[in-house]
Interface confidence: low
């Protein structure tokens, strides 16, 4: 069965995939698909990797991490629920059936709306201006003043995205680690 | 025809700060990924950090987390690149980049379809 990740609608979405090169700059490719793995390939495919570089992406689509390191974790930006469904992450290892196939199963919750606090510096003590997410791979960094007009259903959308990116790296820090070789 | 140029690169003492910025014209800047990268003499082109159009996802080099911060001003068509601690293993030409895609793999050289000129940090011990 596959396992479940969770965002809200309007959050990027985290999807962990790892693999250990061989060797440094060894790289295996790597597809991301929606829907469930297939007996080859990937359906629907959103992403890809060769041995050197990315070689196809489509909108939305991010591999943040550093993926010549083997962090091919999928971010989604800006889901919608139209993104929930089950994505496949298959490394491509050398050789007959040697595939390393993954199913993780997305689900976009609608975004909760909290009623306006009554005092501004309520929202100044519980929100700094820099959220930052801990984990392995390269920040994401939440700027509020680098989101244009903000208002309180999206600073609403930022705190529940703070616990998801909680989660998420926790979910990242006990992600299974596939060794090549 | 898109065009970026940056500009406030100078001379440094070990830990100070320095901020480069990069202003694009000819075409839509809110489409664009926004990417820093780095060439010391005699070495690669390197990655130093990234931004998505929104500003939601940033991405930064291991060597510089911490150090640097990137950010964009969409309604100056400009991007940012804040750069704090300085040391001498970051002198090099700083060269501002942009991708027409909001994916892909904001480390790789090969995404940016759009470079500046450069602008030379020197840091000195």
């Known amino acids: 069965s596959e396992v479940e990740y969770r965002a809200e609608v309007g959050q990027n979405a985290y999807l962990p995939c790892f693999y250990t090169p061989a060797a440094p700059g060894n790289l295996v490719p790597v597809c991301w698909g929606k829907g469930a793995c297939p007996v080859f390939e990937c359906g629907n495919v959103v992403l890809r990797t060769d041995e050197r570089d990315v070689n196809y992406w489509t909108s939305r689509y991010w591999l943040n991490g550093d993926f010549r390191k083997g962090d091919v974790s999928l971010t989604i930006e800006n889901v919608t629920l139209a993104d929930s469904g089950i994505y496949c992450c298959r490394i491509q290892i050398p050789g007959i059936m040697n595939d390393e196939k993954f199913n993780l199963k997305l689900v976009i919750k609608p975004a909760k709306v909290t009623p306006a606090p009554t005092r501004q510096r309520d929202f100044t003590a519980a929100f700094p201006r820099m959220l930052t997410t801990r984990g392995h791979g390269p920040a994401e960094t939440q700027t509020l003043g680098s989101l244009p007009d903000i208002n309180l259903t999206q600073i609403s959308t930022l705190a529940n995205e703070l616990r998801d990116s909680r989660l998420a790296n926790d979910l990242r820090d006990s992600g299974a680690t596939i060794r090549i070789g | 025809q898109v065009q970026l140029q940056e500009s406030g690169g100078g001379l440094v003492q070990t830990g100070d700060s320095l901020r480069l910025s990069c202003v694009v014209s000819?075409?839509?800047?809110?489409?664009?990924?926004m990417g820093w990268f780095r060439q010391a003499p005699g070495k690669e082109r390197e990655f130093v950090s990234a931004?998505?159009?929104?500003?939601?996802?940033?991405v930064y080099a291991d060597s510089v987390k911490g150090r640097f911060t990137i950010s964009r001003d969409n309604a100056k068509n400009a991007v940012y690149l804040q750069m704090g601690s300085l040391k001498p293993g970051d002198t090099a030409v700083y060269y501002c980049?942009?991708?027409?895609?909001?994916?892909?793999?904001?480390?790789?050289?090969?995404?940016?379809?759009?470079w500046g000129q450069g602008t030379q940090v020197t840091v000195s011990s």
């Open positions: 980049a942009a991708a027409a895609i909001d994916g892909g793999t904001v480390r790789s050289i090969n995404s940016y379809a759009y």
């Open positions: 000819g075409g839509t800047f809110r489409n664009y990924v």
């Open positions: 931004m998505n159009w929104s500003g939601g996802i940033t």
